[in-house]
Interface confidence: low
């Protein structure tokens, strides 16, 4: 069958006829819908949210729409015994405690289960000790503190400020560092812009508003009780002490009027240069311990949250594909919530709810895609990617022999500037000719392209005309389809200018603000922003699943390969005489992007050429664009992190949000002129630049011609 | 529209003491931190208190502690400054001005509303 | 204390000339900093917070920049009606000092 015959729509109004459906009222209902009540992953709202979502997406037109059920480990605070922050005197006495919950928004007062701001799988403890500031808590921070400084962490508690990376990683390094309790708060300087108010009145974070979120550092591995397998009703679970990526230490999240109460008695050393202050009207001494008349008062955490196996729920639904129906197209994205889940994760959800809805209007007219698309409301995002995890885990062996791509839809605005777009290499053309033919929602660009405006508000840094798509990283539900299973995959959302709100994420990221009217009132009254939102990403999803020829450009790959491979030589040659003494030798690499660009080449000359009425070599050349993805997973995966098994990009081992090229080289090489054994560190430099160029290699030849 | 009107300024004899008056109109006067700013003849701006939204909270410059009190009257959007014994080198015009919070509840930032002023002599 | 010095004191300048007032902390005060203009016989109006976001209805010739401890009001192409004492403010403790002001004159 060629893919007319799957439409009773003509091809070129496919799309068209899908993008016009979209409605950005529609957006606005769903966003609302969602929005009124708490749905905390494991809870009982939320259960109803996932049946109410299956319920629509049937009515909605698709074939089938299933509920997926695991049992994971989850975290909550103790509902009698509440986590707090106290400074307390030489007689033990507590002289202040820090906020037990959020000032609720207005018209949230009499909303139940709002559960107060806390540390997802924060051990149990109340230690008591003086205390350090770490600023961001990064690796480099940490460098400063006992390397230039000679602050000894160990016994100390810490208290970091959110932002630059992802909180677990903060945590992480406290532990490294011997820390025996985590503060994490939000600094004005990251999470409020100036000349804006905070909630209720403006998009800033009020000083009683505290950011959730999990501290683990699971590294791709899902459930923490069951590593590499799904956690179904006969799962072997590990012993607690076994779990993946627990913190040690007790960890809680405090904002900023609190962090004021604190940080102002700090004493100790000073801060060590401008970067380490924020915007409190507080020295930011580093400490250890309080000034002068309060070196006597301590801190104190009490931390009683409770580890607990809890049963989870994904909604997966199907529309079958007319042509390849063994091909997958996934567009998924997660329903949990810390609270109201405003942004997150409701005007991405909202958005999925009006893509589905489209696809089952055309579908109920006769039409369906080529390929089959799967439309996934992933549970447990918020505790570490753990429904999408363990429902990718349960059926690997599918995805890794029918995966065509993954489009995530998390968030669908984190400001209202221009575009912003993650995706894999083999992505970038669809999405450049895609942001063509769409019309940017932004002011003063009327009647000009998306591509257009997020050009010239995003520039790439590379290729002028052309505009910034990153890396993937982590932090989000594509990470076991990308990083485990090697699967193509991209995300898009609306960004804030990145120039000039320097502040880390949004705001009222994962606070009690995060509500309906946070987004009607401030963000995107008319919903235009969601509307283009929900057109890239539907729009992807349709090429995706209904191009006759997969709209995957090889050479892409080839470009970046040879990029990432001069950043990674060039960072290796900090060191020439170390290269030197080792004999360390880039060459097999850079012969091996060599041989991709020809190959690639040459692949991408016969797909415009060869006979696309012959089903079986259609079929053929496109299961080598769709395997491509899949050739850069080393089974055997990166060193320590056996669920990062893509060789060419991973989140960083500094911050999981962000994504590194070629890490297994990187991470040889990081820090690597303070290793004990430099012999034995610069062996694993050569084995991992041996491992890249291998696997580069081996990815050209699945393009090469096949006999 | 929004403003600032000031009042009680003139001549007062070295020791002596006179109050300041403020009247704020076309805004929340109860959400605003206030401030009082001095001009001597000639001279660049000094400035001399603040006072939180609800009076509990008060800062002054180091030369008026214990002499000058800034006080408020939400009920009456008025903002007061009690100057008590009183120095030649007190001798300014004086400003109210409101405090503009743009960053969160913060107790010193940009003045955006002044006052037009009021001339404060002490002399013998 | 934080002490705010500024430079220079007075400036002779055209109308159509760029301006550029420097304002030094004898501290690190991250960016809270604002800057006035005051004209005689009138009270200061405020012309940049934060170091360097424009006050409302100020024009956009006026821009502000710098962090930490060193800070910079520029003036493009100066009009006549530029032509005043300029102050820097530091906000990042008590007591809040000002600069010594910076007077604008026609050359």
């Known amino acids: 069958k060629s893919s007319n015959e799957a439409t009773n729509i003509t091809p070129k109004h496919n799309m068209k006829a899908f993008l016009d459906e979209l409605k950005a009222e529609n957006i606005k209902k769903f966003l609302y819908n969602f929005t009124q009540i708490p749905h905390l992953a494991g809870t009982e709202q939320n259960f109803q949210l996932a049946k109410q979502i299956q319920s629509q997406w049937k009515e909605f037109g698709l074939d089938s729409v299933e509920l997926a059920h695991y049992d994971v480990l989850l975290s909550y605070p103790n509902k009698t015994h509440p986590n707090y922050i106290s400074i307390i005197n030489e007689d033990g006495n507590e002289i202040f405690n820090t906020s037990l919950f959020e000032p609720p928004p207005p018209g949230y007062e009499n909303v139940s289960d709002i559960v107060p701001p806390f540390s997802a799988f924060s051990p149990q403890g109340m230690p008591e000790g003086d205390l350090v500031y770490v600023n961001y808590a990064r690796t480099e921070d940490f460098f400063k503190l006992e390397r230039d400084m000679k602050i000894n962490c160990s016994g100390k508690i810490v208290i970091a400020r959110y932002g630059k990376v992802f909180r677990g990683n903060k945590v992480k390094n406290a532990q490294l560092a011997g820390a025996k309790g985590v503060i994490l708060y939000s600094d004005p300087a990251d999470y409020f812009a100036p000349g804006v108010k905070s909630y209720p009145d403006g998009w800033n974070l009020p000083g009683g508003g505290v950011q959730r979120g999990n501290i683990l550092n699971l590294n791709g591995a899902g459930d923490p009780l069951t590593p590499g397998y799904p956690a179904n009703e006969y799962a072997y679970r590990r012993g607690i002490a076994e779990a993946v990526g627990l913190p040690s230490i007790p960890v809680h999240p405090i904002g900023y009027y609190d962090a004021q109460k604190l940080l102002e008695k700090m004493g100790g050393s000073a801060p060590p240069d401008s970067s380490w202050r924020g915007s409190l009207k507080v020295p930011y001494n580093v400490g250890p311990g309080f000034t002068g008349n309060f070196s006597t008062q301590k801190v104190k955490m009490h931390i009683h949250s409770t580890n607990e196996v809890t049963r989870i729920y994904n909604v997966i639904g199907t529309l079958r594909g007319a042509v390849e129906p063994d091909r997958y197209v996934i567009l998924g994205g997660h329903r949990d919530s810390w609270v109201f889940g405003g942004i997150d994760p409701q005007s991405g959800a909202a958005v999925v709810h009006e893509i589905v809805r489209s696809f089952g209007t055309l579908k109920k007219e006769g039409w369906r895609p080529r390929r089959t698309i799967l439309f996934a409301s992933w549970d447990a995002e918020e505790f570490g990617l753990l429904g999408s995890t363990e429902w990718a885990e349960e059926n690997s062996r599918l995805l890794q022999e029918r995966g065509v791509a993954y489009i995530n839809a998390d968030s669908s605005i984190e400001g209202n500037y221009t575009l912003r777009v993650d995706c894999t290499p083999l992505m970038y053309s669809l999405v450049h000719n895609l942001t063509k033919e769409l019309k940017s929602p932004d002011e003063g660009f009327e009647g000009k392209s998306l591509y257009e405006s997020w050009t010239k508000k995003s520039p790439s840094p590379e290729f002028s005309g052309m505009p910034r798509i990153s890396k993937l990283g982590s932090g989000n539900d594509f990470e076991v389809f990308f990083q485990r299973l090697g699967i193509a995959s991209g995300r898009a959302r609306y960004t804030k200018n990145w120039e000039t709100n320097k502040f880390s994420g949004y705001p009222l990221y994962h606070s009690v603000y995060e509500t309906y009217e946070l987004v009607e009132k401030f963000y995107d009254p008319m919903f235009k922003y969601h509307l283009t939102v929900a057109q890239v990403r539907g729009g992807m999803v349709f090429e995706l699943a209904n191009s006759i020829v997969l709209p995957f450009d090889c050479r892409d790959y080839a470009v970046v390969l040879r990029k990432y491979a001069d950043k990674i030589y060039s960072i290796s040659m900090k060191h020439p005489q170390e290269m030197k003494t080792y004999s360390v030798s880039f060459d097999s690499l850079f012969s091996a992007v060599k041989n991709f660009t020809e190959i690639a080449s040459k692949f991408s000359e016969r797909l415009q050429d060869f006979d696309k009425s012959n089903p079986i070599v259609l079929r053929m050349m496109n299961d080598q664009l769709m395997f491509l993805e899949r050739a850069f997973i080393d089974p055997l995966g990166l060193p320590d992190r056996p669920f990062y098994r893509h060789v060419i990009y991973a989140p960083s081992s500094h911050n999981k949000y962000a994504g590194e090229s070629f890490p297994g080289i990187y991470d040889a090489l990081f820090d690597i002129e303070s290793k004990v054994d430099p012999s034995k560190a610069w062996g694993e430099v050569k084995r991992q630049i041996y491992v890249a160029a291998f696997t580069v290699q081996a990815a050209a030849e699945t393009l090469s011609e096949v006999a | 529209q929004v403003q600032l009107v000031q009042s009680g300024g003139g001549l007062v004899q070295p020791g002596g003491s006179l109050r300041l008056s403020c009247a704020a109109s076309?805004?929340?006067?109860?959400?605003?931190?206030m401030s009082w700013v001095r001009q001597a003849p000639g001279k660049g701006l000094e400035w001399v208190a603040n006072?939180?939204?609800?009076?509990?909270?008060?800062y002054y410059v180091d030369s008026v502690k214990g002499r000058f009190t800034i006080s408020r009257d939400n009920a009456k959007n008025s903002l007061y400054l009690q100057m008590n014994s009183l120095r030649a080198e007190d001798t300014a015009v004086y400003y109210c001005a409101r405090v503009w919070d743009y960053y969160y509840d913060s107790s010193g930032d940009a003045f955006d509303i002044w006052g037009q002023g009021t001339m404060v002599t002490v002399s013998s | 204390d934080v002490v705010m010095t500024q430079s220079p004191s007075s400036v002779s300048a055209s109308v159509g000339d760029r301006v550029t007032i420097t304002c030094r902390a004898s501290?690190?005060?991250?960016?809270?900093l604002a800057w006035y203009q005051q004209k005689p016989g009138k009270a200061p109006k405020l012309l940049i917070y934060?170091?360097?976001t424009l006050q409302s209805g100020v024009p956009s010739r006026f821009s502000g920049s710098g962090s930490g401890t060193d800070f910079t009001l520029t003036i493009n192409n100066l009009q006549p009606e530029d032509f005043a004492t300029y102050y820097c403010q530091q906000t990042a403790s008590f007591p809040i000092n000002f600069g010594g002001g910076t007077k604008v004159e026609i050359k």
């Open positions: 501290q690190g005060i991250s960016s809270w």
């Open positions: 076309g805004f929340t006067f109860s959400s605003y931190w």
């Open positions: 934060a170091a360097s």
């Open positions: 006072i939180k939204q609800d009076g509990s909270e008060k």
